[in-house]
């Protein structure tokens, strides 16, 4: 008799793929543009990335550091009108893209939550949640919550409002903190909160360090759903050298939880390469004409257009990983087991019941390495086969689809491998 299938977990929409943050509409769309109507025209691009949600804004009226002149119910006219927003929502829904609205109040000011009048601001947020839920948004984001006094209790209250409206609505909180204890204390009182933090931001050094950060986090958070990013708002290139971008894309898409990216992460957008551009929101490079200020700074392979035409580009890798992440059971909600693979390496298995299983091996080092996969670290339910098929490598040159002997696995510097193998009873 065939073994019984394991019961599928309840899956919310944010469990099924990546979220894509557009914090600065003008930078995302390019100079001379930057409104909601223009963003609507970019939804096809977001669809091509297979992202499940768009984290938008803030776009509300905010006069720097002035509580009275901050209105969370009003869209700043520079970004468009309520009608433009409604139209964007409708178009996004048709493309199965959910819209999450950032309501961080004083986004133009020094302290995102103002330095005084905490209760006034919290009331404004509460009113805004109710207003925008009625308007049809799928969730909310609030950032810099380390600047919000009594953040845990406010988040719990806002979570109640959001979930009270519908279980299908999401609340994301962002913090600059990278301290696990601080992160856990925020999560403790908020069961379904998705928290983005700087927890992984210093993980770029070694595979062992990254492995310990990831496993500590997963052990500490138990069976609750996580999100994975390197910060609450900034680009991957703010933290990582170019040679690690592919490795991190592979890792973020294959860890158990929701990967969260900022616009431009998919092409390796790097403010440092664009003189004068702000680190937190450089102009998006759609094509070579996107940065006319200093044309020599931009080459085709830095742009969406150039990378779309190159199957070996970072953008092409992002699209492939996003696609896999949204359709494979083992990646959607599979169990996770990390195990030893040798110095400089981080490796883990994702598996769900009798579905196809995935092995991820990441070489963070700048030398080629032979992987010594320690299968003895794994439970019987997640045992390794002798061979696995190469689904993709972060480096060009490998023959995809070919079976690789796991005992003889060699990785190039900064290479990540995604391998698949079938369930074996």
């Amino acid at each position: 008799r065939a073994p019984r299938c394991r019961e599928l977990p309840a899956q919310k929409w944010w469990h099924t793929g990546a979220l894509y943050r557009i914090g600065d509409l003008q930078a995302f769309q390019g100079h001379g543009a930057g409104n909601l109507a223009g963003l609507k025209g970019r939804l096809d691009y977001l669809s091509s990335l297979k992202v499940k949600g768009l984290v938008l804004g803030p776009i509300h009226k905010n006069q720097k550091d002035d509580v009275a002149q901050t209105d969370l119910l009003q869209i700043d006219p520079n970004f468009g009108s309520k009608e433009d927003f409604d139209s964007l929502l409708q178009s996004a829904k048709k493309k199965s893209i959910r819209v999450i609205l950032d309501l961080t109040p004083n986004y133009r000011g020094e302290n995102s939550w103002f330095s005084t009048q905490v209760d006034t601001v919290a009331t404004k947020v509460k009113d805004a949640l109710e207003f925008w839920l009625q308007a049809g948004v799928d969730g909310f984001q609030v950032r810099d919550i380390e600047n919000l006094k009594d953040a845990s209790s406010f988040l719990a209250e806002w979570q109640n409002i959001t979930k009270g409206f519908s279980e299908d609505r999401l609340l994301i909180a962002g913090t600059n903190s990278s301290d696990l204890q601080q992160i856990l204390s925020l999560l403790e009182s908020n069961k379904d909160l998705l928290l983005t933090s700087s927890y992984l931001s210093d993980s770029g050094s070694t595979g062992e360090h990254t492995k310990s950060l990831v496993t500590q986090y997963l052990n500490a958070t138990g069976n609750r759903w996580c999100s994975w990013s390197l910060s609450q708002a900034r680009l991957l290139t703010s933290f990582l050298p170019a040679q690690l971008l592919r490795l991190y894309q592979l890792m973020l898409f294959t860890l158990p939880g929701t990967p969260v990216f900022s616009y431009g992460d998919e092409i390796g957008l790097d403010a440092a390469a664009l003189p004068g551009q702000p680190m937190e929101a450089p102009v998006m490079l759609w094509d070579e004409s996107s940065f006319p200020d200093i044309p020599g700074a931009v080459s085709a392979n830095m742009t969406v257009k150039g990378q779309s035409e190159d199957p070996g580009s970072l953008l092409s890798l992002f699209r492939r990983l996003s696609d896999q992440r949204s359709k494979e059971r083992s990646l959607l909600h599979g169990d996770f087991h990390a195990f030893s693979a040798g110095p400089g390496l981080f490796s883990y298995i994702r598996h769900w019941d009798q579905n196809e299983r995935f092995l991820v091996v990441l070489n963070f080092g700048d030398v080629g390495l032979s992987a010594g996969l320690q299968a003895s670290d794994l439970p019987a339910s997640a045992s390794l086969p002798a061979k696995a098929d190469l689904l993709l490598s972060t480096q060009p040159g490998r023959e995809e689809g070919s079976p690789l002997e796991l005992e003889r696995l060699k990785l190039e510097p900064h290479e990540g491998l995604l391998l698949r193998f079938p369930y074996a009873a």
Epitope: Q26, H31, G32, G276, P278, A281, S289, G296
Partner: antibody
Framework: QVQLVQSGAEVKKPGASVKVSCKAS????????MHWVRQAPGQGLEWMGL????????SYAQKFQGRVTMTRDTSTSTVYMELSSLRSEDTAVYYC??????????????????WGQGTLVTVSS | DIVMTQSPDSLAVSLGERATINCKSS????????????LAWYQQKPGQPPKLLIY???TRESGVPDRFSGSGSGTDFTLTFSSLQAEDVAVYYC?????????FGPGTKVDI
């Protein structure tokens, strides 16, 4: 009218650092990139780098990377250029110069107009 | 880096005569997307900072006399004085702002 006023001449010993200031007036300070250009005695002009006063992001010429730091103080509309580990060949007049045309706080075309009056930095033991 | 060269190093011209200075870039500074040449010309008199004369290779800065004109495209550019005046004695520099590091030509000294 638009004006850039620089700090006075400096004499420094090799190995020391110098910090030159440039105070802007007559326009919205955060709306234009500021550049630093130097000119050794009897020589041509050499671009050192730029700062975007809006967010403080910088871009330096490779030659000065690691030795130069550009900062700004928006409350006084002043930019600063600090050059460390000075050597005799750093003796020059240092100019601040504003980007010629900006469409937004993050988008500028980089011809230089106007220029500060210049600050002579002499490095001598 | 884009290298800028100028010729001649110096020139002496009679008052009222026409004069030209040439500037060459080691790679094109013409940006096809907007069809603009990222090149500027400056005048520097002794003891003074440089003064902008021309940007976009041929657009005269306001207040600059119309005897100054700029032309050229791609890699080859010219600054022309239609009728040299005594106050035009100075060193003239071209500059590219197409890519960083922004670079200047070595300068051309103009005398009467």
């Amino acid at each position: 009218q638009v004006q850039l006023v620089q700090s006075g001449a400096e004499v420094k010993k090799p190995g020391a650092s110098v910090k030159v200031s440039c105070k802007a007036s007559g326009y919205t300070f955060t709306s234009y990139y500021m550049h630093w250009v130097r000119q050794a005695p009897g020589q041509g002009l050499e671009w050192m780098g730029l700062i975007n006063p809006s967010g403080g992001s910088t871009s330096y010429a490779q030659k000065f990377q690691g030795r130069v730091t550009m900062t700004r103080d928006t409350s006084t509309s002043t930019v600063y250029m600090e050059l460390s580990s000075l050597r005799s060949e750093d003796t020059a007049v240092y100019y601040c110069a504003r980007a010629g045309y900006c469409r937004s706080t993050t988008s500028c075309f980089n011809w230089f107009d106007p220029w500060g009056q210049g600050t002579l930095v002499t490095v001598s033991s | 880096d884009i290298v800028m060269t100028q010729s001649p190093d110096s020139l002496a011209v009679s008052l009222g005569e026409r004069a030209t200075i040439n500037c060459k870039s080691s790679q094109s500074v013409l940006y096809n997307s907007n069809n603009k040449n990222y090149l500027a010309w400056y005048q520097q008199k002794p003891g003074q900072p440089p003064k902008l004369l021309i940007y976009w290779a041929s657009t005269r800065e306001s207040g600059v006399p119309d005897r100054f004109s700029g032309s050229g495209s791609g890699t080859d550019f010219t600054l022309t004085f239609s009728s040299l005046q005594a106050e035009d004695v100075a060193v003239y520099y071209c500059q590219q702002y197409y890519s960083t590091p922004f670079t200047f030509g070595p300068g051309t000294k103009v005398d009467i």
